[in-house]
């Protein structure tokens, strides 16, 4: 493979904590300029595995605000509008990194952590363990 | 109240570019100890949405792999495990922080980015637009 | 250059209701921020009202004097947030300032518009 | 709601005075407090935030401490422009987010 030459302007790397404390520029840049307009908003009404939204807030975290999403019922919506309960509504979760501020009281320093949050939800069919 | 000083450990905030550029501990901290054992890795099959997942790569990205879910259908599974093309299949997604390597290559210093990302889908009743 | 911009205020009798606008620009309404209003009577302090999130969830945190009376919304497209301000009294005239909480850290206002009077008087 | 209380209310001093302006919180905030600059017709100007952290700009005389309840705001070497009101708010969250203003220290000459 190619050798790409180390970048002169890069920060020194001679600090003994290198490489796991790094220099993170916050001018976030944000690729989702191009969002789909039919966006996931509504999704959590219309959905057969309906969910709300749930705010978890920390200001010693960034993003200080995550929402959570928490199944409005055991069941899915049928097509009758009632709750099916021989399906299942559950939550899709994924596994976030977010920053944390640490040591505290240091507002520009920060420890890297990872987080599972439940996104939405979706109707599967249930396991069924058939008793002998 | 006992004033707590600012710690002497704290990255130096007189650099012209902070509060924007910090410093971040990669010894990432895991929050996901009591992970749900049913965790939804076979959910993406046995939803009425399924997806499959794909890999995103990226080596100037951390994390450098992130898993999209693209749902199979356009319609949703029903009882009878046909597609009902009555219901949408539609993604559900989330706006995520990775870190970019910036300036390109040097391993130690990051910019902060958010990119939108599929987490899995879920079966929506579909807006039906009249024609007058 | 980053900046909000109130409008809407002037005489209202009590009673009345009244809106008021906050144009943010050389930013855009995202997840990466609130938007909040607080006012100052003549001569007095700084009191906040509420705060709305930018992003696409609607969630709105209010003081507990103004729950119920006032009420902020938000335009996303017109980068626009709103005051609604119903069966409003003497005692709410006041200078009512738009102001911004980045996402980065929610515990203080970082941007500040120029404020907008309103007086209710009969 | 929290409260928090702010001393002395005015104050006067002269040019190269040390000044200190106190901010007591009615439960604790841990340090999530910042310090506003206010001059007439004007909207507040954020000077610290998290206690202790000077925002951009803010001339180094300015300066934050406390954490908890007891909060500190000191200007080590008053200037004419520094002539002005100035407020502590508080951040908080239990089951909603709040913010609280002190009632304001006018700094006269």
């Known amino acids: 493979g190619i050798t790409i030459p180390r970048n002169p302007g890069c920060p020194n790397s001679e600090d003994k904590n290198f490489p796991r404390t790094v220099m993170v520029n916050l001018n976030i840049h944000n690729r989702n300029t191009n969002t789909n307009p039919k966006r996931s908003s509504d999704y959590y009404n219309r959905s057969t595995s309906p969910w709300n939204l749930h705010r978890n807030e920390d200001p010693e975290r960034y993003p200080s605000v995550i929402w959570e999403a928490k199944c409005r019922h055991l069941g899915c919506i049928n097509a009758d509008g009632n709750v099916d309960y021989h399906m299942n509504s559950v939550p899709i979760q994924q596994e976030i990194l977010v920053l944390r501020r640490e040591p505290p009281h240091c507002p520009n320093s920060f420890r890297l952590e990872k987080i599972l949050v439940s996104v939405g939800c979706t109707c599967v069919t249930p396991i069924v363990h058939h008793v002998a | 109240g006992i004033t707590i000083p600012r710690n002497p450990g704290c990255p130096n905030s007189e650099d012209k570019n902070f509060p924007r550029t910090v410093m971040v501990n990669l010894n990432i901290h895991n929050r996901n100890t009591n992970t749900n054992p049913k965790r939804s890795s076979d959910y993406y099959n046995r939803s009425t949405s399924p997806w499959n997942l794909h890999r995103n790569e990226d080596p100037e990205r951390y994390p450098s792999v992130i898993w999209e879910a693209k749902c199979r259908h356009l319609g949703c599974i029903n009882a009878d495990g046909n597609v009902d093309y009555h219901m949408n299949s539609v993604p559900i997604q989330q706006e995520i922080l990775v870190l970019r390597r910036e300036p390109p290559h040097c391993p130690n210093s990051f910019r902060l980015e958010k990119i939108l990302v599929s987490v899995g889908c879920t079966c929506v009743t579909p807006i039906v637009h009249h024609v007058a | 250059e980053v900046q909000l911009v109130e409008s809407g205020g002037g005489l209202v009798q009590p009673g009345g209701s009244l809106r008021l606008s906050c144009a943010a620009s050389g930013f855009s309404f995202s997840s990466d921020y609130w938007m909040c209003w607080v006012r100052q009577a003549p001569g007095k302090g700084l009191e906040w009202i509420g705060c709305?999130?930018?992003?696409?969830?609607?969630?709105?945190d209010y003081a507990s004097w103004a729950r119920g009376r006032f009420t902020i919304s938000r335009d996303n497209s017109k980068n626009t947030v709103y005051l609604q301000m119903n069966s409003l009294r003497a005692e709410d005239t006041a200078v009512y300032y738009c102001a911004r909480v980045d996402g980065f850290d929610i515990t203080y206002f970082d941007l500040w518009g120029q404020g907008t009077l309103v007086t209710v008087s009969s | 709601d929290i409260q928090m209380t702010q001393s002395p209310s005015s104050l006067s001093a002269s040019v190269g005075d040390r000044v200190t302006i106190t901010c007591q919180a009615s439960q604790t905030i841990n340090y999530w407090l910042a310090w506003y600059q206010q001059k007439p017709g004007k909207a507040p100007k954020l000077l610290i935030y998290r206690a202790s952290t000077l925002a951009s700009g803010v001339p180094s005389r300015f300066s934050g401490s406390g954490s908890g309840t007891d909060f500190t705001l000191t200007i080590s070497s008053l200037q004419p422009e520094d002539f002005a009101t100035y407020y502590c708010q508080n951040y908080y969250y239990s089951t909603s987010r709040s913010y609280g203003f002190g009632g304001g220290t006018k700094l006269t000459v």
């Open positions: 709305i999130y930018a992003g696409d969830v609607d969630d709105t």
